[in-house]
């Protein structure tokens, strides 16, 4: 059980208050982490409060500002990059923001020897990615898609790609569905190590179909937005990876890397790609049919200025029980022979965990193992491989950084952050200098956020980065819920969940409950992390009980309950959260009169069929950008779960999952639906057919609408919204305004 | 020594069936990808079916899709091909080779045997 | 699928003379090509990898050269026992299907 210490003592009681709306729409109660940006083994970059880019030197204790607020202000920059050899920064401003991870920007070099601007071979405007070599200060970036290089910041550029074109080809960045469902990234260019090669994916959507929306702005007309997106079946991008030597780029030209025969034999899709050494590069490939991953090891051939990828290079990885990887495929971590690499994939238990393959993945050496998952492998050194997991305890929410000898034998284990803060931090993450000489620990909760600097060698804290004194104090005098996470056995199935309660919580008393749900595959909302929230809102000042409950699908707990909706979605997510109603309900202090569900997106999708699951259970509920029909979502990532939804494959419960399928069950409950207009993620359409559905139906319901508005609602939008919900579950659970 | 032995060959009306073998030894016949290459009377070589070691993946010349079914049993160290639906134009010589473990060239080679579709 | 041409059908020489055959691909094969002997009555043996590379036990008058889309095998001085059909094969990013070119025909004069 984590509880929140209540720090209420009678005494002081009328001095604390509950948490109010504003508190949560204004951040009152935000936290702060500390990442440095490391520069080498001993130093970090860190923007200071008052924006001076200072540089810290661990070792000797020192630091001193490289780039003054005032330079910073000089062409209003909001970020900043160093280049490797320290001569160089560029200044980014202008941010427009694009899709997830994509924004355009404009660039400034500052050259940091004779403190002035770069002239003379200015960078184009706007940006759409920009990143120095690893070492030196050569610069690769892309302008209308097609990628440039620049040997020196002040040289002319030289132009490596050429038929790059708005929506059709993307040179160096991804398209849509690449950004979101495949690399997560704005980029699509990774330099070699030492900066000798550059290698970069070419994305072809010429065939791919166009959703088409308004954006309605303030003009006479809307302006109609179009984004090349493949639904589920559809045409998808056709990928290519190209590298070019930047020494010479004129000399060969850019170099296309073989696809591996089993994979081009049909759909592709490429996954990610790898630097091992200046002249070995490892490619990551999928199956469109995402159940068999191949990664193929490539080497610089020398004599032939190509790039060579043998069938001894490649490594099959497959999935019989569902899709390959978890979220995404993993990537490898290689080691210092440059051709060994640890990997986390599932073991035959059914449990992902790292395993080191040196040649063949059939013949992989297991190197965690357990009933519990490897999570992220962060760093490889000669002796230590650092990872997390949620080993701990047994707590699948929980996040522990963990430390195995590799140099010794037999290896051992030694849990970095188990102990250090123990009531306080339970969910981590870490940053790694150089070959690991330092790190930083970043704990995320139960307790307030806190980040550390480590020693890489004896893991000693040398000092506190952050630790949120402020939030600390402004909480004193909040009454906060009390948070607990516990489990359910049901049917030889675990169901974590957390319920956060009011501040005088009291079991013998009957609560309204909010059921909060994504439930979306590979996710985790049970986790050990502080938040003030709208829901934390909901209970402190509302008097609401709120459970997030992780049922199968989700992630961290082994492949069973993962892979359970494997060309399923919609079934199990829905029952799963219904299972666990009923058991809140034999807890004794849940007034059944009073259940809601609500959720965003995936969350939105599950909301929905559980209001319409007949059951009677839930008075209303909301759903936030809901999908509706998988046949509407992007193809990369529904295909995954549900693959296509052809006869011959899974259209039949393509069309059962539907929520219009069930507009009828709509009628007995309170539904309020929201969506964004200009939604590029989870189309507009989606909520539009649940209104069409329901309206045929002859189904009254509740609407709103945030005309301009993505998949995040965010800005004047997000108070809207949390407003308009609140009402909306005050008056179904009538309490007064 | 490596050595590939094929064995199956025959007389066959169109329409029929048959199943060639090739017996390996003297390699580590699991790691490797295996194929069949075809010789027509007076002809020249036409590649007919591979499987790879690792992972089991088959592949086909579009002659014979669907019609032939390349397999092997590694715990006998032999590979197969099933030939349905036989036409005349299938009559050959039909050799089974070893692929090079790095690319798909044909470092050794059967001796063949002779299918023969005739009515 | 990858074509290849193989030039001249039949190339008629005396032994101790050189012999060139050629090899053209319809599209690059990088340097991903392969040469085969073969003589009647018996299995082809490789000669030839990686465009330029002899195989074990081949003697070194055999020789290959050339990439992308033109690739030659030069014998330096034919041996009686040279005179055969030289096939070439292509296996451009070890993608199905593999091509064989038509053959050359090596015979004495």
């Known amino acids: 059980i984590v509880l929140r210490p209540s720090r209420v003592h009678n005494s002081e009681e009328n001095t604390m208050r509950a948490l109010t709306l504003k508190d949560i729409l204004n951040g009152t109660f935000s936290y702060k982490t500390f990442f440095p940006n490391w520069i080498s083994g001993q130093e970090y970059l860190h923007q200071s409060a008052d924006n001076n880019i200072v540089l810290y030197n661990i070792e000797t204790g020192q630091s001193y500002t490289i780039l003054s607020n005032r330079t910073m202000k000089s062409v209003n920059a909001s970020n900043y990059g160093l280049s490797p050899d320290r001569q160089f920064v560029y200044l980014e401003s202008d941010y427009s923001k694009l899709w997830r991870y994509s924004y355009t920007a404009t660039y400034y070099i500052y050259d940091l020897s004779n403190g002035e601007f770069v002239r003379g071979n200015e960078l184009p405007r706007p940006i759409q990615y920009l990143c120095w070599s690893p070492v030196g200060s050569k610069l690769a970036y892309v302008y209308q898609n097609n990628i440039y290089l620049k040997q020196r910041p002040g040289d002319p550029p030289f132009q490596i790609t050429f038929n790059g074109r708005e929506n059709k080809i993307f040179n160096g960045i991804p398209d849509w569905v690449y950004e979101e469902e495949m690399l997560a990234t704005k980029y699509a260019l990774w330099w070699s190590p030492n900066g000798k090669f550059l290698a970069y994916a070419e994305f072809n959507d010429t065939d791919i179909p166009v959703i088409a929306y308004s954006y309605y702005g303030d003009e006479q007309y809307p302006r109609t937005i179009n984004i090349p997106y493949p639904k589920a079946g559809a045409k998808n991008p056709v990928v290519r990876i190209f590298i070019i030597d930047t020494t010479y780029p004129a000399y060969v030209g850019p170099q296309e890397v073989p696809v591996p025969a089993m994979i081009a034999s049909s759909d592709y899709y490429f996954s990610w790609l790898t630097w091992v050494t200046d002249e070995r590069v490892c490619l990551q490939w999928l199956k469109r049919v995402q159940n068999v991953s191949v990664l193929s090891i490539c080497d610089f051939r020398e004599d032939w200025q190509t790039w060579d990828c043998p069938k001894t290079q490649e490594h099959i990885e497959e999935s019989r029980t569902g899709w390959a990887g978890g979220f995404f495929v993993s990537t490898p971590v290689f080691s210092y022979d440059a051709i060994s690499y640890y990997k986390i994939f599932s073991d035959k238990d059914g449990y992902k965990h790292i395993h080191y393959i040196k040649d063949t993945v059939e013949n992989a050496i297991q190197i965690t193992s357990g009933k519990w998952e490897a999570i992220n492998i962060f760093r490889v050194t000669q002796d230590s491989l650092f990872y997390s997991s949620n080993e701990f305890e047994e707590y699948p929410g929980r996040r522990n950084i963990y430390r195995i000898s590799i140099g010794s034998y037999p290896p051992s284990k030694k849990c970095v952050t188990c102990h250090l803060r123990k009531e306080r931090c339970q969910y981590y993450t870490a940053s790694f200098s150089d070959y690991a000489k330092y790190y930083a620990l970043v704990c995320y909760g139960p307790g307030i956020p806190i980040s550390t600097l480590h020693d890489g060698r004896t893991d000693q804290e040398i000092k506190i980065l952050e630790e949120n004194k402020e939030l600390e104090n402004a909480l004193k005098n909040i009454q906060l819920p009390k948070e607990e996470i516990k489990k359910l056995e049901v049917d030889e199935i675990t169901l974590w969940y957390k319920m956060i309660l009011p501040p005088q919580f009291d079991r013998s008393k009957k609560y309204p409950l909010l059921i909060q749900v994504y439930g979306g595959p590979c996710s985790q909302s049970v986790r050990s992390v502080f938040a003030v929230n709208w829901i934390s809102y909901l209970a402190s000042k509302e008097g609401m009980v709120i459970a997030l409950v992780d049922g199968r699908g989700t992630a961290f707990q082994g492949d069973k309950l993962l892979y359970a909706v494997y060309r399923k979605l919609g079934v199990y997510e829905v029952e799963d959260q219904i299972t666990a109603v009923r058991k809140f309900i034999e807890m004794g202090f849940i007034d059944e009169k009073r259940i809601a569900i609500w959720g965003w997106s995936y969350g939105g999708y599950v909301s929905s069929l559980a209001l319409a699951s007949g059951t009677g259970l839930f008075k209303c509920g909301i759903a936030v950008a809901p999908v509706s029909s998988w046949e509407y979502y992007a193809s990369v990532y529904t295909e995954r779960f549900m693959g296509l939804p052809t006869k011959d494959d899974n259209l039949e419960h393509y069309k059962n999952s539907t929520v219009m399928a069930r507009a009828e069950y709509f009628r007995n409950v309170d539904y309020l639906l929201i969506h964004g207009t200009a939604d590029d993620n989870v189309h507009f359409q989606n909520s539009a057919q649940i209104a069409k559905a329901l309206v045929n139906a002859q189904v009254d319901f509740q609407a709103m609408w945030y005309s301009d508005q993505n998949h995040g609602l965010s800005g004047l939008s997000t108070n809207h919204l949390y407003t308009h919900m609140t009402h909306f579950l005050k008056q179904c659970f009538s309490l007064s305004d | 020594d490596v050595q590939l032995v094929e064995s199956g060959g025959g007389v066959v009306r169109p329409g029929e069936s048959l199943t060639l073998s090739c017996a390996a030894s003297?390699?580590?016949?699991?790691?490797?990808?295996m194929g069949w290459v075809r010789q027509a009377p007076g002809e020249g070589l036409e590649w007919v079916s591979g499987?790879?070691?690792?992972?089991?993946?088959?592949y086909y010349a579009e002659s014979v899709k669907g019609r032939f079914t390349i397999s092997r049993e590694s715990s006998k160290n032999t590979l197969y091909l099933q030939m349905n639906s036989l036409r005349a134009e299938d009559t050959a010589v039909y050799y089974c080779?070893?692929?090079?473990?790095?690319?798909?060239?044909?470092?050794?080679w059967g001796l063949g045997t002779l299918v023969t579709v005739s009515s | 699928e990858i074509v290849l041409t193989q030039s001249p059908g039949t190339l008629s020489l005396s032994p101790g003379e050189r012999a060139t055959l050629s090899c053209r691909a319809s599209?690059?094969?990088?340097?991903?090509l392969a040469w085969y002997q073969q003589k009647p009555g018996q299995a082809p043996r490789l000669l030839i990898y990686d465009a330029s590379n002899r195989a074990i036990d081949i003697p070194d008058r055999f020789s290959g050269s050339g990439s992308g889309t033109e690739f030659t095998l030069t014998i330096s001085r034919l041996e009686p026992e040279d005179f055969a059909v030289y096939y070439c094969?292509?296996?451009?990013?070890?993608?199905?299907?593999?091509?064989f070119g038509g053959g050359t025909k090596v015979e004495i004069k």
């Open positions: 499987i790879r070691g690792r992972g089991g993946s088959t």
């Open positions: 599209q690059s094969v990088g340097h991903y």
């Open positions: 094969q292509q296996y451009y990013n070890d993608w199905p299907p593999l091509t």
């Open positions: 003297g390699f580590t016949f699991s790691s490797y990808d």
């Open positions: 080779a070893k692929e090079n473990e790095r690319h798909s060239f044909f470092e050794y």
